[in-house]
Interface confidence: low
């Protein structure tokens, strides 16, 4: 079955259908008579029970809370409750980019080596029965592909294949037309024994935090075996007892390259942790690449343009 929504923090684009599926679904079927409730809270607002009367955009089906569509004011915390089982999600609804066919903050980056097998298949299992047609766009220009239900690209990668690929599913619900967009930033890299290491994701990340809480900054890179990934912060690393570098995780690819991930954990965030650079660097004989994180107090979020924000 469609996997339940296990991620506790979710970012979604306004105007698209969206659903939350709780993770005790099989259990809920067995206990049909058990009271099952969905709640929302946002800001100072207390838990408000959700039902189809709450909004014409909300639908409840078995294990799922559906939004038709999700809008900016749906941002908040959502709870599912059944007997002594509770599941919580934090939903952040972001503005759609009206000047593009996709929203930059909702792009999945993938790296494909030149001459290696390259494939994009447009599928959306949850809404499959409602989808009328699906289109695949490259850099917001529609690609003419035979199959308009599940358009697919299968080929050996060339440098010309680099770009933004958007799968757009068009579907009807209660007489209205909706679309769901999934976009991939495909980067084609040289097929060679040593790659130029690259950090994944934006170069500058503003992270909204609350004082006294904890945050985990994740730094991921594609690199060679002998390359190193490290964090730099403050005048002297290790001076803050609340900052901890977690153990580096590495997974090898068949080509002998590595995907590495290193987390910087900041506990009990204080004023001294705000508005300073936490730099993650990947270094190799071929050069270095650095990305930066800046912690910003949640109350100050409004001062920063939305496009530079990250979760």
């Amino acid at each position: 079955a469609e996997s339940c929504t296990s991620r506790p923090h979710i970012t979604v684009v306004e105007g698209e259908p969206f659903y939350l599926k709780h993770c005790s679904c099989s259990l809920a079927h067995e206990i049909e008579t058990t009271t099952k409730s969905w709640y929302k809270s946002s800001g100072s607002q207390e838990h408000v029970e959700l039902n189809p009367r709450s909004s014409s955009r909300i639908a409840l089906h078995d294990c799922v809370l559906e939004f038709w569509p999700v809008e900016l004011n749906d941002t908040g915390s959502y709870f599912f409750q059944m007997k002594n089982y509770t599941q919580k999600w934090k939903l952040n609804v972001i503005r759609r980019n009206k000047h593009s066919c996709f929203t930059e903050r909702q792009v999945t980056s993938k790296i494909v080596e030149v001459k290696k097998f390259f494939q994009i298949t447009c599928e959306n299992s949850y809404y499959q029965t409602l989808v009328n047609s699906t289109s695949l766009y490259k850099n917001c220009k529609k690609l003419l592909l035979e199959n308009n239900k599940n358009p697919t690209i299968k080929k050996n990668a060339e440098f010309e294949d680099q770009g933004y690929y958007s799968c757009v599913h068009f579907l009807h619900h209660n007489g209205k037309l909706f679309n769901i967009t999934k976009t991939f930033n495909i980067t084609i890299v040289e097929d060679r024994s040593n790659i130029v290491p690259v950090l994944l994701g934006p170069k500058l990340n503003h992270v909204a935090v609350e004082l006294g809480k904890n945050v985990r900054l994740n730094c991921s890179a594609l690199l060679n075996e002998e390359d190193v990934i490290y964090w730099m912060f403050g005048e002297e690393n290790g001076s803050d007892p609340n900052i901890h570098e977690e153990k580096e995780m590495r997974i090898m690819t068949p080509e002998g390259k590595w995907h590495a991930s290193k987390v910087l954990r900041i506990e009990n965030i204080g004023e001294s942790n705000l508005n300073v650079l936490y730099n993650c660097t990947v270094a190799s004989t071929g050069g270095t690449d650095t990305k930066s994180f800046i912690l910003v107090r949640k109350a100050d979020m409004a001062d920063i343009p939305g496009h530079v924000f990250t979760r």
Epitope: V112, K116, F117, F118, E123, S125, K154, E255, H259
Partner: nanobody, 126 residues
Framework: EVQLVESGGGLVQPGGSLRLSCAAS????????ISWFRQAPGQEREVVSC????????IYADSVKGRFTISSDNAKNTVYLQMNSLKPEDTAVYYC???????????????????WGQGTQVTVSS
């Protein structure tokens, strides 16, 4: 409807072998990345191995390299995990997962899967 059904788990002595199967349906099998994850009690879920049936990419976590082998049978839409030289620390619930937006090459098993199976218990004990 997408389905991932695992089988083959059980109790085995240290040094023994098991073969896990993951039968997939409801999506384009050769356009996906199929991963095996595991979760031991009180531990975080970790990726063990991944295969892309479309391009033959395979990856392994360091802890299982040389002991585990992942393979796929495209005709049966099934992925196998052959586990040899099992150790007590391999004890966990093993989950099959699918990333149906896989696009080839280096990212097998690294993105959050779209779908998960129910899991099968593997216990290594004397």
């Amino acid at each position: 409807e997408v389905q991932l059904v695992e089988s083959g788990g059980g109790l085995v002595q240290p040094g023994g072998s098991l073969r896990l199967s993951c039968a997939a349906s409801g999506f384009t099998f050769d356009g996906a990345a199929i991963s095996w994850f595991r979760q031991a009690p009180g531990q975080e879920r970790e990726v063990v191995s991944c295969v892309s049936p479309g391009d033959g990419t395979t990856i392994y976590a360091d802890s299982v390299k040389g002991r585990f082998t992942i393979s796929s049978d495209n005709a049966k839409n099934t992925v196998y995990l052959q586990m040899n030289s099992l150790k007590p620390e391999d004890t966990a619930v093993y989950y099959c997962a699918a990333d149906t937006y896989y696009s080839g090459g280096a990212h097998c098993g690294l993105l959050s899967p779209d779908y998960w199976g129910q899991g099968t218990q593997v216990t290594v004990s004397s």
